[in-house]
């Protein structure tokens, strides 16, 4: 039974050329987190934190994505194309998969950054029908 909940930074805005921190936090479960994946709105993978090996920033983003703080992610040198949804996916044992959503709006103007921290409903899936199975590459 999946008892956990994910809190995220929710809907946030940041200035073009600036940086922003994406944060997710899993609570209310004793499940062991084996890895956390960060994914962009177009399903491109940004980063992963493996419990044993640590952080890996996917190479296409290595110059403008930084790990942390914590299990969060820092996006740098923001462009208008960075506007959109971001997802954190917690892979846990024995619970399975928890997923959180953040919406980032990148602003042209110098509007101050703001963030609303709130809880969102969890999306829980068992490993055996995890969507990541479909990410395998075949040759």
């Amino acid at each position: 039974m999946m008892t956990g909940t994910i809190e995220t930074t929710g809907n946030i805005s940041a200035k073009k050329g600036g940086s922003v921190i994406l944060q997710c936090h899993l609570s209310s479960t004793m499940a062991q987190v084996t890895q956390v994946n960060w994914e962009q709105h177009d399903h491109s993978l940004l980063a992963i934190r493996n419990a044993e090996l640590g952080w890996h920033i996917y190479p296409a983003f290595k110059d403008r994505v930084a790990p942390g703080p914590g299990l969060g992610l820092t996006l740098q040198s923001l462009t208008m194309n960075d506007t959109g949804e971001y997802f954190c996916t917690y892979h846990t044992y024995p619970d399975g998969t928890y997923r959180g959503r953040i919406f980032l709006e990148v602003l042209e103007s110098s509007v101050a950054e703001h963030s609303a921290r709130f809880q969102i409903p969890i999306e829980g899936r068992d490993y055996k029908d995890d969507d990541d199975k479909h990410h395998h590459h075949h040759h």
Partner: antibody, heavy 126, light 109 residues
Amino acid sequence: QVQLQESGPGLVRPSGTLSLTCAVSGDSISSSNWWSWVRQPPGKGLEWIGEIYHSGNTNYNPSLKSRGTISVDKSKNQFSLKLTSITAADTAVYYCARARVYDILTGRGYYGMDVWGQGTTVTVSS
Amino acid sequence: SYELTQPPSVSVSPGQTARITCSGDALPKKYAYWYQQKSGQAPVLVIHEDRKRPSGIPERFSGSSSGTMATLTISGAQVEDEADYYCFSTDSSGNPRVFGGGTKLTVLG
């Protein structure tokens, strides 16, 4: 301590098939790693041959032109390389290696080949 | 096909800093890895993902990457660092993975 040990014939006839095996100890062949083959012709550099994930997914060096096949035998905790239509250019020291990954579900997020066998010499000659 | 270019040889005196370069058109969007191979031995991973050092690798080994060039730096090279060094690159989707031609590092004892 993870160890890899290559085995196979030291001499192969031209146009024949080369079959090599890599025995894995200290780790499970079913764990989330890419199991890789690399070779080194005498006096030359390293050449990546290909790899297999525990799921059965494979990647190969395009230069092999479909001559190579990598497979896993979970019951024996080993993986193998078969190379067909062998020529003298395939003479080399063949290494097997373990490549770790960050994404244990999909095999993405390459950490690097952190454990290697000691290598086995294969000579192609009639 | 994708290629990585390294200088054939680099020489330094003990205690000096050795720099070995690796160039490749796709390196801005790929990671560089560095393997050390001493004579008659299997390769050893000394740097992964441009700049990360595996446990057990001395701190004098470091890596960096800028644009199409990756660099392995050995600060205060020692005689035991004499070896062939190979850069290696891959993207996260896996294919192709490729080695550079290798650089022979001589530490003039």
